[in-house]
């Protein structure tokens, strides 16, 4: 889409509500394999004071534990600071608050730096619609198609959702 466009005026609050994880990608495949630290699944999100609060589901011992995390705002509108398995610079990469959200994180843990990307959608029945956008963002940030893992219902703790 070339040219200039009018944009909406809403804020982070538009991201609030239920989300479903659809795909993960990383330059360190172990991080997003089963039992990897970043094989986690979004449950819901809310925004307050410019910070993002997320409830995530973490597979543990055959069950899923819900954990609350807060990503704190920075001077850059699409960047947040998150502490989870080390320090993360979390970036919103592409967003349609009614449909999908793509974020990526630069994780620093024990002097090791990793890149993890995450695609989430509002409506799981439309997940295929947004995989091309995820692949495009992954390309932008230096991840390849073969570094993407598309999740199945079994993967994403569906049974743990309210």
């Amino acid at each position: 889409q070339e040219g200039n466009h009018e944009e909406p005026q809403g804020g982070l609050e538009e991201l609030s509500g239920r989300w479903h994880s659809v795909a993960l990608a990383s330059n360190k495949s172990d991080l997003i394999k089963p039992w990897g630290h970043f094989r986690v699944f979004i449950h819901s999100m809310s925004a307050k004071d410019g910070n993002l609060h997320g409830d995530i589901l973490i597979p543990q011992d055959g069950q899923c534990e819900k954990v609350s995390l807060t990503a704190f705002k920075t001077a850059t509108s699409n960047k947040f600071d998150l502490e989870y398995w080390g320090h993360n610079d979390l970036y919103l990469a592409e967003v349609d608050p009614k449909s999908y959200l793509i974020l990526y994180m630069i994780n620093q843990y024990n002097d090791d730096t990793s890149l993890v990307a995450h695609l989430m959608v509002r409506d799981l029945s439309r997940q295929q619609d947004f995989l091309p956008a995820f692949e495009s963002v992954c390309e932008d940030i230096g991840l390849h198609k073969d570094q993407i893992v598309v999740l199945s219902d079994d993967d994403r703790c569906q049974g743990s959702r309210d």
Epitope: Q1, H5, S77, D89, L92, A93, D96, Y104
Partner: nanobody, 117 residues
């Protein structure tokens, strides 16, 4: 309405340097990718360099080692420092930004860079 405004173009002798700048207006959730493309007469627009929010860069092979892209996320600005310019670098240089909002792509009006031998 999103606008990208370029500056810094002009004429220079081969071997010289120029620095292009681009300021983007505030956008919903900001920009994930910013960068520069160029178009020489009779040719298609081509990538010069891009930089993502986290600082990762991508350069066209023809400019690697000569051009450096940088960015100030808080100010929505992107710069392109061009050294060791040669005649083949003559083109209109377009600022590019990919917004977080819907992944929309935006372009500046372009700034002329002319390198003479």
């Amino acid at each position: 309405q999103v606008q990208l405004v370029e500056s810094g173009g002009g004429g220079v002798q081969a071997g010289g340097s120029l620095r292009l700048s681009c300021v983007a207006s505030q956008s919903h959730f900001g920009y994930n990718v910013m960068g520069w493309y160029r178009q020489a007469p009779g040719r298609q627009r081509e990538l010069v360099a891009t930089i993502i929010s986290s600082g990762g860069t991508n350069y066209a092979d023809s400019v690697k080692g000569r051009f450096t892209i940088s960015r100030d996320n808080a100010k929505n600005t992107v710069h392109l420092s061009m050294d060791s310019l040669n005649v083949e670098d003559t083109a209109v240089y377009f600022c590019y930004a990919k917004g977080v909002w819907l992944g929309r792509e935006y372009w500046g009006q372009g700034t002329q860079v002319t390198v003479s031998s």
